[in-house]
Amino acid sequence: LSTCKTIDMELVKRKRIEAIRGQILSKLRLASPPSQGEVPPGPLPEAVLALYNSTRDRVAGESAEPEPEPEADYYAKEVTRVLMVETHNEIYDKFKQSTHSIYMFFNTSELREAVPEPVLLSRAELRLLRLKLKVEQHVELYQKYSNNSWRYLSNRLLAPSDSPEWLSFDVTGVVRQWLSRGGEIEGFRLSAHCSCDSRDNTLQVDINGFTTGRRGDLATIHGMNRPFLLLMATPLERAQHLQSSRHRR
Amino acid sequence: LSTCKTIDMELVKRKRIEAIRGQILSKLRLASPPSQGEVPPGPLPEAVLALYNSTRDRVAGESAEPEPEPEADYYAKEVTRVLMVETHNEIYDKFKQSTHSIYMFFNTSELREAVPEPVLLSRAELRLLRLKLKVEQHVELYQKYSNNSWRYLSNRLLAPSDSPEWLSFDVTGVVRQWLSRGGEIEGFRLSAHCSCDSRDNTLQVDINGFTTGRRGDLATIHGMNRPFLLLMATPLERAQHLQSSRHRR
Amino acid sequence: ALDTNYCFSSTEKNCCVRQLYIDFRKDLGWKWIHEPKGYHANFCLGPCPYIWSLDTQYSKVLALYNQHNPGASAAPCCVPQALEPLPIVYYVGRKPKVEQLSNMIVRSCKCS
Amino acid sequence: ALDTNYCFSSTEKNCCVRQLYIDFRKDLGWKWIHEPKGYHANFCLGPCPYIWSLDTQYSKVLALYNQHNPGASAAPCCVPQALEPLPIVYYVGRKPKVEQLSNMIVRSCKCS
């Protein structure tokens, strides 16, 4: 299946070395190496070394190179969606009174039906249809954590818009957690971003699936367009196949 | 410089088409196309089409594919750094009293000296040396916007740590703005994340360059390790060279 | 960038993304993919001149180097740079499935 | 992944990242780069068998396809996948400069 030729590794290395010579000079836009005639004697200045080290060292929060895709990512992912539990469900009752937040709960049995094992999940997105918005709004997404606490997940700055628009939040890690745990119902909260000084924390944005009055009230659900989780996962039978063929060529 | 051969485009296309046949089947782990014998007559169910459309449509907030690097990114970037204005500067006086924030100001003349034109800047990072931290802390970075308002930039969840650690925030867009504007001094604010309900908004993390008492107080600056901006930019002479050779091969 | 915007509107002989639309019925003889009916797969084609040689005029070479051999390969090759996924709908038995196939559409190429 | 962890510890004949350390003095005859003294450039080498042929045993082909021709190229090629930058220190006249060179170190390869 492959045309076999003996590879002269030394020749390839020499060609690569010559290419690197050109690459470095061209990246610096130098036609030839710079003269060293004026370089002061002694070691490099401290400040220069510090700057070199700052550049060389990877830092927390700096984006590393993208990881090459694992073998499992080559294969197709089955796509399913799980709609938010309707807002007349009793779970919403204790979260009614807030003007700065809306709540979205999901049935984990439905999630498990779609993705039987956490390891099979490759991506989960929370999708919300935001209706038109008059002013810019900074919103935050939280995950329901324990009895009455919420864990911050991410934020988004929403620009004003005259037309409805789908928003998507990557919640893969959270849904993977939910699939591992025993809970029956799990949820998210979308809140206005509250800064430490400002006190105007009303959630201005309207999300399809909630009435536009007091947000937690019993809601009119507009068909299939209420918030949902879009799940991409390796089907179980394909995963079993993958595990059994964990060999290098 | 190149060995010229006539390329049979049709043959290449046929090979690509055959490769795609294999690619699709292998991604689905199918040895052959699935039989259509049991497919119900009529159009696809509405729910399936909705799901297909959800998957197909790019959504606000979903990460698009990375943009290919522009030509300018091929060339080397000169690295410089600009240290934060020392905390005994009068600019800090009006920002002294907060327990939830620390402030970092930078001299734009120093920035302009390092990067004469905004377009030359390819990356700017705000680097902070965080000292040991006993509890997890969620922090937010803001940019000084107008007289007394701050614009949210990004956030970070800091894990507890026994040793000092550099933090890096990408602030390329902000520094590019500063280089375009006429201001003399520009700044950032690092704050505790304040949620709408919680009232414990103290910034627990210690950043090198500020005393560990009341944060805005006159500070002991620990050498070169106070907050700084790490700048990567195309040198002016290289940029002029680039503009004059804006031709396709 | 050697992307669809540039390559589809030029007569570039060197490495570029080339147009290729796959019609599942006509090109692959497949009726089993219900959506989409086809897709713009595209492909990369064209030489990546090595262009680094000590007997060439150095300054001319410098200007071209980043186009033809940015990775300083021993033998640069025209390959996909930006790829996009393709969702499909097909049936397994009586059950419709929506699946996403990664890296199916070539948006741009590079010499690597 | 065809990365340094796998390739440097195996005798893989097909596409893989290969070790190559560049010593600026010895390999390029350069004294003008003050830091670093050299770097692990590495390179990609090895065939990418086409492996899609109707006379091969189909099921065996399926298992290998994603290794050898994941991008369904007409002629897959062994090229860098993950690259890292290299900062250097050199002098222009009396002035030291720190510059970052993008995509200088090959960390992994792929058939594309």
């Epitope: 039978e237 079993q240 | 199918l30 040895a31 052959s32 196309p33 699935p34 039989s35 259509q36 014998g37 049991e38 | 003889g29 009726k31 397994v92 038995g93 009586r94 059950k95 | 109707l54």
Partner: antibody
Framework: EVQLVESGGGLVQPGGSLRLSCAAS????????MSWVRQAPGKGLEWLGF??????????EYSASVKGRFTISRDNSQNSLYLQMNSLKTEDTAVYYC???????????WGQGTLLTVSS | DIQMTQSPSSLSASVGDRLTISCRAS??????LNWYQQKPGKTVKLLIY???RLHSGVPSRFSGSGSGTDYTLTISSLQPEDVATYFC?????????FGQGTKLEIK
């Protein structure tokens, strides 16, 4: 290794009933459709029907010649497939094979068969 | 139902011969054509699926081709163990249907 073993064949009078069994091993039973195919003496093969897999809800499909008289079922806990045959006719005399069906429209593994004779 | 017609119904050939068996469908079956082998007194075995794909463990002297309504099974060099009846089957449209079989003997 995939194995299918049929049992339960024998001599039955016209109008009678019989249940054939097929024991499966060597694969994940619930992932596959299971089918029955028969071959009358000296004749070709005739597909009788199948029972679908778990994702397809274990529903059944039959050929017109046996619909209403034959019922296919499965016991997934036992990795077993069954064919319940009622109102048997002399033309039902055949070797009955159970076969594993794949989504590609083909039967990749077959049992050795069990002979049913319908005669008075 | 789709009718499948095989030809010839029987054939006799020598060891080492190249031979072909044909199968015609009453309508286009989009390459969903499979071939089976049944040796005397033995069970049925899958040889080829989807027109040309060799099932695992099947010798490479067996091959398949065709499209639309016409399909062919080829044995490139006949071996004594190839004595059997060969059936084609369409997997395009329910109900699945088989050809009547081709009986192969050695001269």
């Amino acid at each position: 290794e995939v194995q299918l073993v049929e049992s339960g064949g024998g001599l039955v009078q016209p109008g009678g009933s019989l249940r054939l069994s097929c024991a499966a091993s060597g694969f994940t039973f619930t992932d596959y459709y299971m089918s029955w195919v028969r071959q009358a003496p000296g004749k070709g093969l005739e597909w009788l029907g199948f029972i679908r897999n778990k994702p397809n809800g274990y529903t059944t499909e039959y050929s017109a010649s046996v619909k209403g008289r034959f019922t296919i079922s499965r016991d997934n806990s036992q990795n077993s497939l069954y064919l319940q045959m009622n109102s048997l006719k002399t033309e039902d005399t055949a070797v009955y094979y159970c076969a594993r069906y794949t989504g590609g429209g083909y039967f990749d593994y077959w049992g050795q068969g069990t002979l049913l004779t319908v005669s008075s | 139902d789709i009718q499948m017609t095989q030809s010839p119904s029987s054939l006799s050939a020598s060891v080492g011969d190249r031979l072909t068996i044909s199968c015609r469908a009453s309508q286009d079956i989009s390459n969903y054509l499979n071939w089976y082998q049944q040796k005397p007194g033995k069970t049925v075995k899958l040889l080829i699926y989807y027109t040309s794909r060799l099932h695992s463990g099947v010798p490479s002297r067996f091959s398949g081709s065709g499209s639309g309504t016409d399909y062919t099974l080829t044995i490139s060099s006949l071996q004594p163990e190839d004595v059997a009846t060969y059936f084609c089957q369409q997997g395009d449209t329910l109900p699945w249907t088989f050809g009547q079989g081709t009986k192969l003997e050695i001269k």
